[in-house]
Structures are given as structure tokens and as C-alpha cells.
């Protein structure tokens, strides 16, 4: 049986979203903006 609690629309609680990395300066050498820690 699948014991992890679910929201009513069927997604597991605690699944962390993964935004696409943002590179504001485009073609310049840079690191991406930090990911949000949202669950």
C-alpha cells in the first residue's frame, strides 16, 4: 500500500518543485539564481 499522505489532487506531500534556473546576465559567465526551498 502507498502510505504517503496525498493532497486531494493526488500529488505527494513534500514533493519539492524544481524551477528552471535563471541566468539574468545571459551570455556572461555567471551562476544561476538560487532555487526556492518550497514544498
Amino acid at each position: 500500500s502507498y502510505s504517503m499522505e496525498h493532497f486531494r489532487w493526488g500529488k505527494p506531500v513534500g514533493k519539492k518543485r524544481r524551477p528552471v534556473k535563471v541566468y539574468p546576465n545571459g551570455a556572461e559567465d555567471e551562476s544561476a539564481e538560487a532555487f526556492p526551498l518550497e514544498f
Epitope: 518543485r17 524544481r18 524551477p19 528552471v20 534556473k21 535563471v22 541566468y23 539574468p24 546576465n25 545571459g26 551570455a27 559567465d29 551562476s31 544561476a32 539564481e33 526556492p36 518550497e38
Partner: antibody
């Protein structure tokens, strides 16, 4: 100056397979960038296909692209997009881009026709 | 899937005028929204990210706003060079089909 350039486009018959290449210059994918593919049909809007995290190798796809499109990192400066079971609806200019940024390639045109 | 509904499809304003483009997400996307400008035969150019942050080198005449599900791009003091198609894109969740584009808005400068 960082640049991206797509290649491999051209005329392909319905049902065929085509592999596009996105080549980076001025930087390498070793650092773990998101490299994404999008397309644009003639006179139409932009459509997101999917992305690869070049560090982990993890791939992510639009629901409509899953199973027919495959994104791979093939070297420290190249990412490919393999497309199978092509139809006329796949006729478009295909772009690769560095995540959310202004760094996009100029695009390569894919025409699916018999 | 996150659906991005962009309005209007086309707008025409005179030089010096103001244009407002709206983008509505089918679910909350926090502030994970980008705006692009695309001219014929060219790839898109990033104008705004995080809903309201202006990309380096982009004119302050471009202003983004909104959070959650409702977003706007306002172009003030229109110039001929602003004639282009503008797209919104969410990048909220790459792992759950959450990177879709809006349908685009063609801006005609008279």
C-alpha cells in the same frame, strides 16, 4: 562571449527521426546549466519542449513531448534533441537556450514533409 | 499542466503611448514568470524575470508586475523599436510540466 548554436535541421519524411545538436561556445556544460529546447511553428507561438540539467544529467519534458523527444548531453559543449515519429505538426524552428535567459541559439528549421 | 493565457493577441498604439499585456496562469506560480520580446527572424530576448526584475541592459520603460496567477507587462513611452511579439513564460516547476509559454501578443507601433 557565450553563444549557442543549433544544427541538424532539414527536410525529413513523416514517421522519420531527426537529431538536432546544440553547441556551446565560450563556456562548457560541466558546471551544471539548464539547457532547454523550444520550438516555433511557422507564424506560430513558442512551445517549450524540455530541458536537461547538464550537471546531473536529469531531463525534464513537456507532457506532449514525453516518449517521442529525448534530450541528452553528448559532450562538455553539446546537447542533442532526438525526435522520433515526426509528423507535419512538428515542422518548426527549433531553439536551444540556457535556462531562462537571453542566451538562445538562432534556431534551426525542421520541415516534415513527404 | 500549467496553462498560460496571454491577452490581448494583438495591440496597436502610437509612438509615445502605453501598452499593457496580461498573462494569467491556471495555477499559482509564485513570481516565477519571465517576459520575452521576439522580432521576426530572431530568437526571443529576455526582458523580465521573477515577474518584475529587469534584465541588464533593458530599458526601464518595460515594467513587469504581479504574483500568483495574474501578471502584467507594461511598455510605456512606446518607440518604433518596441514593435515585436511578446511572450510570457512560467518556469515554476520544470519537473511537472510547469514551463509553458503564453500565446504571445503582437505589439504594433503606429
Amino acid at each position: 562571449q557565450q553563444q549557442l548554436e543549433e544544427s541538424g535541421g532539414g527536410l525529413v519524411k513523416p514517421g522519420g527521426t531527426l537529431t538536432l545538436t546544440c553547441k556551446a561556445s565560450g563556456f562548457s556544460f560541466s558546471s551544471g546549466y539548464d539547457i532547454c529546447w523550444a520550438r516555433q511553428g511557422p507564424g506560430k507561438g513558442l512551445e517549450w519542449i524540455g530541458c536537461i540539467d547538464t550537471g546531473s544529467g536529469n531531463t525534464y519534458y513537456a507532457s506532449w513531448a514525453k516518449g517521442r523527444f529525448t534530450i541528452s548531453r553528448t559532450s562538455s559543449t553539446t546537447v542533442t534533441l532526438q525526435m522520433t515519429s515526426l509528423t507535419a505538426a512538428d515542422t518548426a524552428t527549433y531553439f536551444c537556450a540556457k535556462g531562462i535567459s537571453s542566451l538562445w541559439g538562432p534556431g534551426t528549421l525542421v520541415t516534415v514533409s513527404s | 499542466d500549467i496553462v498560460m493565457t496571454q491577452t490581448p493577441a494583438s495591440v496597436s498604439e502610437p509612438v509615445g503611448g502605453t501598452v499593457t499585456i496580461k498573462c494569467q496562469a491556471s495555477q499559482t506560480i509564485s513570481s516565477d514568470l519571465a517576459w520575452y520580446q521576439q522580432k521576426p527572424g530572431q530568437p526571443p530576448k529576455l526582458l523580465i524575470y521573477a515577474a518584475s526584475k529587469l534584465t541588464s541592459g533593458v530599458s526601464s520603460r518595460f515594467k513587469g508586475g504581479g504574483t500568483g496567477t495574474q501578471f502584467t507587462l507594461t511598455i510605456s513611452d512606446l518607440e518604433c523599436a518596441d514593435a515585436a511579439t511578446y511572450y510570457c513564460q512560467t518556469y515554476y516547476d520544470i519537473s511537472d510540466d510547469g514551463c509553458t509559454f503564453g500565446g504571445g501578443t503582437e505589439v504594433v507601433v503606429k
